[in-house]
């Protein structure tokens, strides 16, 4: 019995599985959203291109006390090759506008679905 991504997993999770699980988590968040996500917290929007996973984590990691996105934060850290901490922004991260976390999640989800369809798993 294999629990992909869990402690019982015998080896590294294939990139396609990890991406699918991230997409499923984001779908979960958007569908289960009753009150405004993370109390309407605003985060820096990101360029959904190179370094997207690290940039997404850099944005979301600043939001604390929002249990709804904690799993997403952990999952994104698996896609980012370096350690990310709050307040840290790479040179790839252009801070030109802030958007609500709910919108951020929707935008990220749409883009990840596109990547999955195109077979871009890394």
């Amino acid at each position: 019995l294999t629990c992909l991504g869990g402690f019982a997993s015998p080896g590294p999770v294939p990139p396609s599985t990890a991406l699918r699980e991230l997409i499923e988590e984001l779908v979960n968040i958007t569908q289960n959203q009753k009150a405004p996500l993370c109390n309407g917290s605003m985060v820096w929007s990101i360029n959904l291109t190179a370094g997207m996973y690290c940039a997404a984590l850099e944005s979301l990691i600043n939001v604390s006390g929002c249990s709804a996105i904690e799993k997403t934060q952990r999952m994104l850290s698996g896609f980012c090759p370096h350690k990310v901490s709050a307040g840290q922004f790479s040179s790839l991260h252009v801070r030109d506008t802030k958007i609500e976390v709910a919108q951020f999640v929707k935008d990220l989800l749409l883009h990840l679905k596109k990547l999955f369809r195109e077979g871009q798993f890394n």
Partner: nanobody
């Protein structure tokens, strides 16, 4: 307990100026990034501006760039938004906010109406 108490706002003619203030208490103000956010009647939330903890770095939405200035006085635990060349589309309720915290740590909001 975190508190953000806003003042300023009101009715102003197009082209006029206003300054909003936000007095903070209950947290270490000079360690926090701060935001101004607004909500126009019947619209969603719109980010306006952000200032770094030390006040040296500022960011603005394209819609207010060159007209609005965010600043802070860490010795007074106060955040400011100077609004010049106001337009009808700037009419909104303005909120000061401790960045990344959502409604939990927002000011009570202040209405800015730009009309002749």
């Amino acid at each position: 307990e975190v508190q953000l108490l806003q003042s300023g706002g009101g009715l102003v003619q197009p082209g006029g100026s206003l300054r909003l203030s936000c007095a903070a208490s209950g947290f270490t103000f000079d360690r926090e990034e701060m935001d101004w956010v607004r909500q126009a009647p019947g619209k969603g939330l719109e980010w306006v501006s952000t200032i770094s903890p030390n006040g040296r770095t500022t960011y603005y939405a394209d819609s207010v760039k060159g007209r609005f200035t965010i600043s802070r006085d860490n010795s007074k635990n106060t955040l400011y938004l100077q609004m010049n060349s106001l337009r009808a589309e700037d009419t909104a309720v303005y909120y000061c906010a401790k960045a990344y915290t959502g409604f939990r740590y927002w000011g009570q909001g202040t209405l800015v109406t730009v009309s002749s």
